[in-house]
Every structure is written in structure tokens, then in C-alpha cells.
């Protein structure tokens, strides 16, 4: 079958109430079939490519475990399995300050060096 292209699928927006939790869905496709090398998953806030990271995890070659390296205030947790092309993120104890746009990003390293980031992101509305 032909190789897939890079793409990312996120909903335009997610709404939740302050104090509750929210899930920010993000799935992706990539052209590197059977890739099982090192992988990093990142979520950033505000703007793509340059906004501050709120979550980052890394998986070693051959591992499904994406070990958390950064979780801002300990409130961000990966629900999706990046090896299954899912970067969905859970945000706990929402505050009004969390009302912003979030962008998911995946990076491959090792034999393959490639990365992709959602350009439009998902808008989190906190009420």
C-alpha cells in the first residue's frame, strides 16, 4: 500500500468547566511505515512551533512507554498511545488561564529524523 503522508487531526475546539478535566484529542498519520525508533510527543500552548511547551514525553526504541519529561504543574497526562498514532492529552483541574489554543507535535529520531506539528491546534474553552 502507498505510504501515508504526514497529517494531524484535532478538533477545532473543546469546552470544559473550571475545576474539571478535559481531553484534547490529537491523532496523526506519517509516512514511516513500521517505525519503532525513538519518539517524542509534545504539546505546546499559545502558538504553533514557538509557544511554551506544557507537556513532553519520550519513548525509547522499541518501547510503547512514553516517559513524561514535562507536565506543567503536573496537570497534563498523555492518554493516547503515540505508537498507535494517538497523542490525546488529558488536562486536570482546569483553570481559566488554561483557556487557549494547544498544538500537538511528534518527533521521530534514530534511523529516521522527521517531525510534524498541528498548525491550527485545538482551542480549549474554559468556562
Amino acid at each position: 500500500s502507498p505510504a501515508q503522508r504526514w497529517s494531524m487531526q484535532v478538533p477545532p475546539e473543546v469546552s470544559a468547566e473550571a475545576g474539571d478535566a478535559a481531553v484534547l484529542p490529537c491523532t496523526f498519520t506519517h509516512p514511516h511505515r513500521h517505525y519503532d525508533g525513538p519518539l517524542t510527543a509534545i504539546w505546546r500552548a499559545g502558538e504553533p512551533y514557538a509557544g511554551p511547551q506544557v507537556f513532553r514525553c519520550a519513548a525509547a526504541r522499541g518501547s510503547e512507554l512514553c516517559q513524561t519529561a514535562l507536565s506543567l504543574h503536573g496537570r497534563f497526562r498523555l492518554l493516547g498511545n503515540p505508537r498507535r498514532n494517538d497523542l490525546s492529552l488529558r488536562v486536570e483541574r482546569l483553570a481559566l488561564a488554561d483557556d487557549r489554543r494547544y498544538f500537538c507535535r511528534v518527533e521521530f529520531a534514530g534511523d529516521v529524523h522527521d517531525r510534524y506539528e498541528s498548525r491550527h491546534g485545538v482551542r480549549l474553552h474554559v468556562t
Epitope: 491523532t27 513500521h34 517505525y35 510503547e64 512507554l65 516517559q67 492518554l79 493516547g80 498511545n81
Partner: antibody
Amino acid sequence: QVQLVQSGAEVKKPGASVKVSCKASGYTFPRYDVSWVRQAPGQGLEWIGVIHPGSGGTGYNEKFKARVTITADTSTSTAYMELSSLRSEDTAVYYCARRGLNKGYWFFDFWGQGTLVTVSS
Amino acid sequence: DIVMTQSPDSLAVSLGERATINCKASQNVGSNVDWYQQKPGQSPKLLIYESTNRYTGVPDRFSGSGSGTDFTLTISSLQAEDVAVYYCMQSNFFPFTFGQGTKVEIK
């Protein structure tokens, strides 16, 4: 051939801790994730958590996170699962399972024989 | 957490007949469902991974299908040695979650 051999059955009192071991052989231990799964008597399967022995990184089911610690010793190719503050509902068979992979697909391809942990006063 | 619901809970099928087990996920899990067989007193064994891929050494009477939220394990011609409990498991989201199991017996 790949083998996962677990420690023997345990009987513990409520509030105590138990540590179950899983000795791997027949493959390069640090390269593959090892998960722990439990099965209460007559019940289904429940994923507890995972370790990547090569890095020591762990991931836990939130349900168990406050009470479980998974470790690995690469010098002896052994993974461990310690569960604290035991209660009667923790009575179960505890399995270790290797997370094998093939062409970018992951799956539990080899399982230990299981360790029965009984919690009773 | 993702809830995996199997149906039926138990199934009695005549030798040589077809057995079909369904598994429904509470949300989209792509094709990331595996099927495991557990015989009495034994550890689970992998049958099918990634919804449709038969694991090494598994007889071709076992097949899997489905994606999204609905998955099926089929035993095309039931043999005596197939008496067991069968579990589906999703690995698209953490924590991994299993169905409650389906017991397959001989009618």
C-alpha cells in the same frame, strides 16, 4: 526460547505489601517493555502498569498509581511489581507479560505463569 | 478509561460450527485491538493483534475483523481445544483495557 518465570504464591494480611518477581530469559531483556496484569478469581484481566527495563521508565494505571511500584534489574533480567496497602480486593493472580513487537505492531506475546496473591486476615 | 464490552458472555457451539465473539469499545480505538485466549488454569495467549493479524502459530480458523468501535473474533470451525475464555484488549489509549471475557464451550 522466551520464558517469563514468576515467583511463588503469597499470602498477605490487609495493609501489608507484596513484591512479585518475573525473571526473563531467551531474549534481550532491556529492549522490551514488560507489563503487569492481574486477574481476580473468576474475573477478567486488568492492566496495572509497564516498565521499559532499558531506561527504567514506568507507566501506571491511575487506579493503582498510589500503591504500585514496578522496577527492573537488568543484571538479572528480572522485573518486579510491588503493591502496598493490600486489601481483600487485591486477591488475584498477577501476571507479567512481554510487550513484543513486529513491524511496528505491539502485543503481549509471552506471559509468565502467574502468581497468586491472597490477602486475608 | 476505555470500556471494552464483549458479547455474548458465554457461547455454546457444536464442534465444527462457527463461533463469533463481538467486542465494542466505548470510543474509537482505531484498529488497535488484540484478542487473547485463556484456557482454565493457564496464562492468556495471543491470537490476533491489530484487529486482523493472526499471531505466529495460531490456526487459520481464528480470524479477526473490525475497526473504530466494533470488533469481531471468529472461529470458523470450532475444535475441542478451543474451549476457553476469549478477551479483547485495546491499546490505543492508556490504560490498556480488556473486555470482560467470553466463555466458549462445546454444545
